[in-house]
């Protein structure tokens, strides 16, 4: 009765177990009772990343600059090329097949997490006591100016989009001692 299973680095063919080809190599011919599996290295710009019985190697991914892509890590015979996005852009998917411009946080929102090559900007609403008056992919919410520390008073309250406006102290409420 012929075998129905093989060990992990083998494959079943013609009722026998043949060695798989190592990563970086493709199958040229199956083994026989008396000859080993024949494998050949993948060519330039090709790869195979597992023990395999593939007769063709896979082409390395092309990082298309027209899509905002650039090479993050050059492929080898055992690994695919890894693409990332140009500065100011991020991948639209895990496979990084194209890029989009980083999102900016509108006035009233600040940057919680700056974008990377693979993730977009994360914005957060400015909480009470903080503001952002610009549309930016980098600026966090800024704290309102503390009028008190400048010996001034609040003349106009701040919002999530504007800073407080400070002004001089009310003279009537100020006691000056003249000597």
């Amino acid at each position: 009765e012929p075998p129905t299973a093989c060990r992990e680095k083998q494959y079943l063919i013609n009722s026998q177990c043949c060695s798989l080809c190592q990563p970086g190599q493709k199958l040229v011919s199956d083994c026989t009772e008396f000859t080993e599996t024949e494998c050949l290295p993948c060519g330039e710009s090709e790869f195979l990343d597992t023990w395999n019985r593939e007769t063709h190697c896979h082409q390395h991914k092309y990082c298309d600059p027209n899509l905002g892509l650039r090479v993050q890590q050059k492929g080898t015979s055992e690994t695919d090329t890894i693409c990332t996005c140009e500065e100011g852009w991020h991948c639209t998917s895990e496979a990084c097949e194209s890029c989009v411009l980083h999102r900016s946080c509108s006035p009233g929102f600040g940057v919680k997490q700056i974008a990377t090559g693979v993730s977009d900007t994360i914005c957060e609403p400015c909480p009470v006591g903080f503001f952002s008056n610009v549309s930016s992919a980098f600026e966090k919410c800024h704290p309102w100016t503390s009028c008190e520390t400048k010996d001034l008073v609040v003349q106009q309250a701040g919002t999530n989009k504007t800073d407080v406006v400070c002004g001089p102290q009310d003279r009537l409420r100020h006691h000056h001692h003249h000597h």
Partner: antibody, heavy 127, light 107 residues
Framework: EVQLLESGGGLVRPGGSLRLSCAAS????????MNWVRQAPGKGLEWVSY????????DYADSVKGRFTVSRDNSKNLLYLQMNSLRAEDTAVYYC????????????????????WGQGTMVTVSS | DIQLTQSPSSLTASVGDRVTITCRSS??????LAWYQQKPGKPPKLLIY???SLEVGVPSRFSGSGSGTDFTLTISSLQPEDFATYYC?????????FGQGTKLEIK
């Protein structure tokens, strides 16, 4: 130190059941294919069963097919052999053994061998 | 199933002798053969894998050769600790099988 330790052997009546365990230490058993091999008193080695690293693939000697079941718990580094409908001819020392794939990237093909063996556990089937 | 036949079944030799054990397969197994040494009351110990590759830590007096159906294990100069039983095993396909063993005794 890389070690395998079998347990669960003993005396059992014909038709009875027994579950052998094999505890791996010093290495991650889940990364290796494993085997059970037995040796009847005064006799040679007989391969009994195989299990792949994930437990997905199993195979058995014709003499135990349908009666024995090999399994593993990789989270506990344990290998098992469930033996049912035991017969007198199953009397033997049972060894668990690690399958290793020897590979030199400069060579074309690798090779298998059983490089780590337990001390064995004795199973006696008798009335 | 693939049958392995070892010869001789037993042999007596002296320290310093050169000893050869053969293993014949019922069908071609390329170089998917291993050799083991077993001493009484102990588990087998891997000596050779892939028909001719020496396992780490095994003395260089042990060597293996052959491919296809005919294989040999050679001990170039017997040492007292080499007296044991030797088994060949095919790992070409399931079911994996062992030879019946060769008992090497001291003369």
């Amino acid at each position: 130190e890389v070690q395998l330790l079998e347990s669960g052997g003993g005396l059992v009546r014909p038709g009875g059941s027994l579950r052998l365990s094999c505890a791996a230490s010093g290495f991650t058993a889940g990364s290796y294919e494993m085997n059970w091999v037995r040796q009847a008193p005064g006799k040679g080695l007989e391969w009994v069963s195989y299990i792949s690293s994930s437990g997905e693939t199993t195979d058995y000697a014709d003499s135990v097919k349908g009666r024995f079941t090999v399994s593993r718990d990789n989270s506990k580094n344990l290998l098992y052999l469930q033996m049912n409908s035991l017969r007198a001819e199953d009397t033997a020392v049972y060894y668990c053994a690690r399958d290793v794939f020897f590979f030199d990237s400069s060579g074309d093909n690798g090779a298998y061998g059983m490089d780590v063996w337990g001390q064995g556990t004795m199973v006696t089937v008798s009335s | 199933d693939i049958q392995l036949t070892q010869s001789p079944s037993s042999l007596t030799a002296s320290v310093g002798d050169r000893v050869t054990i053969t293993c014949r397969s019922s069908q071609g197994i390329r170089s998917s053969l291993a050799w083991y040494q077993q001493k009484p009351g102990k588990p087998p110990k891997l000596l050779i894998y892939g028909a001719s590759s020496l396992e780490v830590g095994v003395p260089s007096r042990f060597s293996g050769s052959g491919s296809g159906t005919d294989f040999t294990l050679t001990i170039s100069s017997l040492q007292p600790e080499d007296f044991a039983t030797y088994y060949c095993q095919q790992l070409n396909s399931f079911p994996s099988t062992f030879g019946q063993g060769t008992k090497l005794e001291i003369k």
